[in-house]
C-alpha cells in the first residue's frame, strides 16, 4: 500500500522522493504525476525533469530540494481538499525495465481554526521556488533562478524556530529524509519511507 503523508488546507504539502545519481550531474529523468504509477510514465504529469533540468511543470507543483543531487521531492503549494489522492514519483533509469516507481498518498485535512496568528518565517523564503525556462513548460513563462544550497543545520534551525507550528513538521521531515539514514517516523500524522 502507499505511504501516507498529510497536510492541512492552505499549507504546502511535501512528498519525498530521492535517488542517487551515478555521478554528480549525471541525472536521470524523473516524472511526478497525479494518480498511481502506471506501467510507464506518470499518469497525469505535473512535473518532469530530464538529464539536466526541470523541463515541464504546472502551477503549484515544484521542487525545493537539490534535484541535481537526486532530491526530487515534490512540494504542492497552498493545497486544497482536491489535492488529496495518490501521487506517483517515477525515476526513469535507462535500460531494460529499470524504472523505480513510488506511490505516495496525500491526505488533506481541513485547516484548524487558530485563535491568533503566530509569527513564523515564510516557508517559501526558506525554500525558494526552483524556476526554469527549459522545455515543454505550460503557457506561463518563468525566469531562471538559482537554487541555494540549504544545509541540514539551516533546516534544523528553521525547524526549531517553527516547532510549535504545523509547518515545523514539514521542515523536520525534510531534514530527516534528506539525511536518509533510515526509515523515519515523526508523529501519528506522517509515515515516511526512505525511497532511495
Amino acid at each position: 500500500s502507499e505511504v501516507e503523508y498529510r497536510a492541512e488546507v492552505g499549507q504546502n504539502a511535501y512528498l519525498p522522493c530521492f535517488y542517487t545519481p551515478a555521478a554528480p550531474g549525471n541525472l536521470v529523468p524523473v516524472c511526478w504525476g497525479k494518480g498511481a504509477c502506471p506501467v510507464f510514465e506518470c499518469g497525469n504529469v505535473v512535473l518532469r525533469t530530464d538529464e539536466r533540468d526541470v523541463n515541464y511543470w504546472t502551477s503549484r507543483y515544484w521542487l525545493n530540494g537539490d534535484f541535481r543531487k537526486g532530491d526530487v521531492s515534490l512540494t504542492i503549494e497552498n493545497v486544497t481538499l482536491a489535492d488529496s489522492g495518490i501521487y506517483c514519483c517515477r525515476i526513469q533509469i535507462p535500460g531494460i525495465m529499470n524504472d523505480e516507481k513510488f506511490n505516495l498518498k496525500l491526505v488533506i485535512k481541513p485547516a484548524k481554526v487558530t485563535p491568533a496568528p503566530t509569527r513564523q518565517r515564510d516557508f517559501t523564503a526558506a525554500f525558494p521556488r526552483m524556476l526554469t525556462t527549459r522545455g515543454h513548460g505550460p503557457a506561463e513563462t518563468q525566469t531562471l533562478g538559482s537554487l541555494p544550497d540549504i544545509n541540514l543545520t539551516q533546516i534544523s534551525t528553521l525547524a526549531n524556530e517553527l516547532r510549535d507550528s504545523r509547518l515545523a513538521n514539514d521542515l523536520r521531515d525534510s531534514g530527516a529524509t534528506i539525511r536518509g539514514s533510515s526509515d523515519y517516523k515523526d508523529d501519528d500524522d506522517k509515515h515516511h519511507h526512505h525511497h532511495h
Epitope: 506501467v39 510507464f40 510514465e41 506518470c42 497525469n44 526513469q92 535500460g95 525495465m97
Partner: antibody, heavy 122, light 107 residues
Framework: EVKLVESEGGLVQPGSSMKLSCTAS????????MAWVRQVPEKGLEWVAN????????YYLDSLKSRFIISRDNAKNILYLQMNSLKSDDTATYYC???????????????WGQGTLVTVSA | DIQMTQSPASLSASVGETVTITCRAS??????LAWYQQKQGKSPQLLVY???TLAEGVPSRFSGSGSGTQFSLKINSLQPEDFGSYYC?????????FGAGTKLELK
C-alpha cells in the same frame, strides 16, 4: 492524419532472425512511447514490447526479452523490432502501436499499424 | 502478472439492443484500463481509455465504467458496424495484459 505502416513480414525458418520496422507519420514521433503487440491467427492480443521517447528505456514480455529487441530512430520516425532465434510459436500478426505521450494521461494504444504476418515454419 | 478475465466469451445480440461486456483484473489497476474493438482481418481500434474516457471519434453509444478490479463496456442501441471482437487491456502493471476477448455476433 496519424499513420503507422509496418514493413512486410513473411515466412522464416525456425532459429532464424527477422527485423520488422514501422514508419510513423502525422504526429511528433519522439513525443510518444511506442509498442509492438502481436496476435496469433484467430486468437487474442499479446503485448510484446514498449520503448520510451528517446529509446533509453525498453520494456518486454519476460519470455521474449532474451530474443527480441525494440528500438527506434527518431530522426527517421521509425520503430523497429529485431526478432532472433525465432520459434514456431512466434508465428503471429505483429502490430506497432502508439502508446502514452509526453504528458501522460491517455493510457491506451490510440493508433495501430495494419499489422504484418510473420510465419515461422520449416 | 495481472490477469484480465473478460466475460462473456461470446454474445449474440440484435441491432438496437444494449449489451454489456465485463472485465475483471486480478489486482487493483486503478483506472488504467482500455477497451478495443477488432473486426475480422483488421487492426484493433481504441474505444475507451482510462476506464471511462471515450477515444476520439468513438460514438457516444459506447461507454466505459469501473475502477480497481471491476470494469465494464456498455454499448447502447447496437448498430450493424458494432459486431466483432472486444478486448480489455490493463496499462498498470508489467507485462501489459489483454483479456481473452468477447465475440459479439449478430443474432
Amino acid at each position: 492524419e496519424v499513420k503507422l505502416v509496418e514493413s512486410e513480414g513473411g515466412l522464416v525458418q525456425p532459429g532464424s532472425s527477422m527485423k520488422l520496422s514501422c514508419t510513423a507519420s502525422g504526429f511528433t514521433f519522439s513525443d510518444y512511447y511506442m509498442a509492438w503487440v502481436r496476435q496469433v491467427p484467430e486468437k487474442g492480443l499479446e503485448w510484446v514490447a514498449n520503448i520510451n521517447y528517446d529509446g533509453s528505456s525498453t520494456y518486454y514480455l519476460d519470455s521474449l526479452k532474451s530474443r527480441f529487441i525494440i528500438s527506434r530512430d527518431n530522426a527517421k520516425n521509425i520503430l523497429y523490432l529485431q526478432m532472433n532465434s525465432l520459434k514456431s510459436d512466434d508465428t503471429a500478426t505483429y502490430y506497432c502501436a502508439r502508446d502514452v505521450g509526453y504528458y501522460g494521461g491517455n493510457y491506451g494504444f490510440a493508433y495501430w499499424g495494419q499489422g504484418t504476418l510473420v510465419t515461422v515454419s520449416a | 502478472d495481472i490477469q484480465m478475465t473478460q466475460s462473456p466469451a461470446s454474445l449474440s445480440a440484435s441491432v438496437g439492443e444494449t449489451v454489456t461486456i465485463t472485465c475483471r483484473a486480478s489486482d487493483n489497476i486503478y483506472s488504467y484500463l482500455a477497451w478495443y474493438q477488432q473486426k475480422q482481418g483488421k487492426s484493433p481500434q481504441l474505444l475507451v481509455y482510462n476506464a471511462k474516457t471515450l477515444a476520439e471519434g468513438v460514438p457516444s453509444r459506447f461507454s466505459g465504467s469501473g475502477s480497481g478490479t471491476q470494469f465494464s463496456l456498455k454499448i447502447n442501441s447496437l448498430q450493424p458496424e458494432d459486431f466483432g471482437s472486444y478486448y480489455c487491456q490493463q496499462h498498470y502493471g508489467s507485462p501489459l495484459t489483454f483479456g481473452a476477448g468477447t465475440k459479439l455476433e449478430l443474432k
